[in-house]
C-alpha cells in the first residue's frame, strides 16, 4: 500500500494517526517539501542577524547580518564584524595595518606591499594602509638621471598584528 | 550557492611532481583568503598555508616552507597545491578551505597516495 | 609559532556534559574556533571566536576562552556528537593559523 504520507504538499506535515490526514504547518515551522512527517522549526534571526526573508509554511527563513558585520558560511550561519580598509580584525578590535602592509577590504586581514624590485621594476605610487604600492617601468628603462618614486618596498613578509 | 571543488584522488610514485587543485565558485574568489590543510591517515589537520588569489600573496605554516608550493589562478577561480618531488610522506588528505582564521567553507579534499 | 595541546581522547555518557580543553601559551589573546570532523566528511564549524555558535548548530555547543586554555562544551551530549574534535587558532605574529591535534570524542 502506497504511503499516504506521500501526498501531503509542502506546508503540511503527515499527521501519526491512522488516516494520515495532512496536518497545515504550525507558527513558526515549515516543510519544504511534500510527504514530511513533522514541520522543521524556523530559523530566527536575532542578534547581529537579521531577517533577510521571513519564514512561510513552505520554506526556512534567511538571515543575513546587521549592518558592520559580513556572512561567513553557507546561507549566512555566521557573523564577523567588518574594519575600515586599512586594518584588520583583532581579538581587541579594529587595528590599522602595520607599515608595509595594507587590505584594501572590509574584512580579511593585511598583506604586505609588492616587493617591485623582486620584478626589476621601481615603484610608481607609494603604498598605503589601504593600497598596495604601484610598480613602474623597471629603473633601466627609465631616462638617464631618473629614479623611482622612492625607494623599493620592503619584501613581502606577513604582517605582526596580534589577533 | 558557494562551492570550492577539488581535483580528484591520485595515486604516484616517490620522487613524481604533482598538482591538484581547487576551484571556487558562488562568490567573489579574488577576495578571499583560500588555505590549505593536510590529514596524514588516521592522524589530525595540519594548517600548511594560505593565498590571496587577488594577487596572489601566499604565506606558509614553518612546517611546510619549502616542501611545497602554493598558487592560484584568479581568472579560473583555481588554486593550487603542489609538489616537485613527492615522498611516502605526502600520503594523506589534502583539503582547500576559504578563510585565513575561521574556514567556513571546505573542499571534498583530494587524496594523495605515494607509494613505490 | 603557537601550538595547541587537546586531550586525544574524551568520553561521556549520553546526556552528561563532555568538556574538551585546548591549551596554548596565551591562547585567551587570541580568537579561538572549534571544528567537528566525522569519518570521511570535511570539518564543520561548530563554535567560532570563543564562544559564537554558527546558526543550525544545536544549542547544547557553547565555548569559552581565556589565558592558556580554550574550552568546547558540549551540555546533553547526544549520539550524533561521537567525531573529532579540532581547535584551532590564528596569529597575527607570523600570519599563521594552527590546529590543536584533536581529541575523539566518545559517547558511551
Known amino acids: 500500500i502506497q504511503d499516504s504520507c506521500s501526498k501531503c504538499p509542502a506546508g503540511t506535515f503527515c499527521g501519526k494517526n491512522k488516516s494520515q490526514i495532512c496536518i497545515p504547518c504550525p507558527p513558526n515551522s515549515f516543510s519544504s517539501t511534500s510527504g514530511q512527517k513533522a514541520c522543521d522549526i524556523c530559523r530566527q534571526c536575532e542578534g547581529v542577524f537579521r531577517t533577510k526573508k521571513v519564514c512561510s509554511s513552505t520554506s526556512n527563513a534567511e538571515c543575513d547580518c546587521i549592518s558592520g558585520f559580513h556572512c561567513l558560511g553557507a546561507g549566512c550561519t555566521m557573523c564577523e564584524q567588518d574594519c575600515k580598509q586599512g586594518q584588520e580584525l583583532t581579538k581587541k578590535g579594529c587595528k590599522d595595518c602595520c607599515f608595509g602592509t595594507f587590505n584594501d577590504q572590509k574584512r580579511g586581514i593585511c598583506r604586505p606591499w609588492t616587493n617591485c624590485s623582486l620584478d626589476g621594476k621601481s615603484v610608481l605610487v607609494n603604498g598605503t594602509k589601504e593600497r598596495d604600492v604601484v610598480c613602474g617601468p623597471s629603473p633601466a628603462d627609465l631616462s638617464p638621471g631618473a629614479s623611482s618614486v622612492t625607494p623599493p618596498a620592503p619584501a613581502r613578509e606577513p604582517g605582526h598584528s596580534p589577533q | 550557492q558557494v562551492q570550492l571543488v577539488q581535483s580528484g584522488a591520485e595515486v604516484k610514485k616517490p620522487g613524481e611532481s604533482l598538482k591538484i587543485s581547487c576551484k571556487g565558485s558562488?562568490?567573489?574568489?579574488?577576495?578571499?583568503?583560500i588555505s590549505w590543510v593536510r590529514q596524514m591517515p588516521g592522524k589530525g589537520l595540519e594548517w600548511m598555508g594560505k593565498i590571496y588569489p587577488g594577487d596572489s600573496y601566499t604565506n606558509y605554516s614553518p612546517s611546510f616552507q619549502g616542501q611545497v608550493t602554493i598558487s592560484a589562478d584568479k581568472s579560473i577561480s583555481t588554486a593550487y597545491l603542489q609538489w616537485s618531488s613527492l615522498k611516502a610522506s605526502d600520503t594523506a588528505m589534502y583539503y582547500c578551505a576559504r578563510g585565513y582564521g575561521i574556514f567556513d567553507y571546505w573542499g571534498q579534499g583530494t587524496l594523495v597516495t605515494v607509494s613505490s | 609559532d603557537i601550538e595547541l595541546t587537546q586531550p586525544p581522547s574524551v568520553s561521556v555518557a549520553p546526556g552528561q556534559t563532555a568538556r574538551i580543553s585546548c591549551s596554548g601559551d596565551?591562547?585567551?589573546?587570541?580568537?579561538a574556533h572549534w571544528y567537528q570532523q566525522k569519518p570521511g566528511q570535511a570539518p564543520v564549524v561548530v563554535i567560532y571566536q570563543d564562544k559564537n555558535r554558527p546558526s543550525g548548530i544545536p544549542e547544547r555547543f557553547s565555548g569559552s576562552n581565556s589565558g592558556n586554555t580554550a574550552t568546547l562544551t558540549i551540555s546533553g551530549t547526544q549520539a550524533e556528537d561521537e567525531a573529532d574534535y579540532y581547535c584551532a587558532t590564528y596569529t597575527g605574529f607570523g600570519s599563521l593559523a594552527v590546529f590543536g591535534g584533536g581529541t575523539k570524542l566518545t559517547v558511551l
Open positions: 558562488g562568490y567573489s574568489f579574488s577576495t578571499y583568503w
Open positions: 596565551n591562547i585567551g589573546d587570541q580568537y
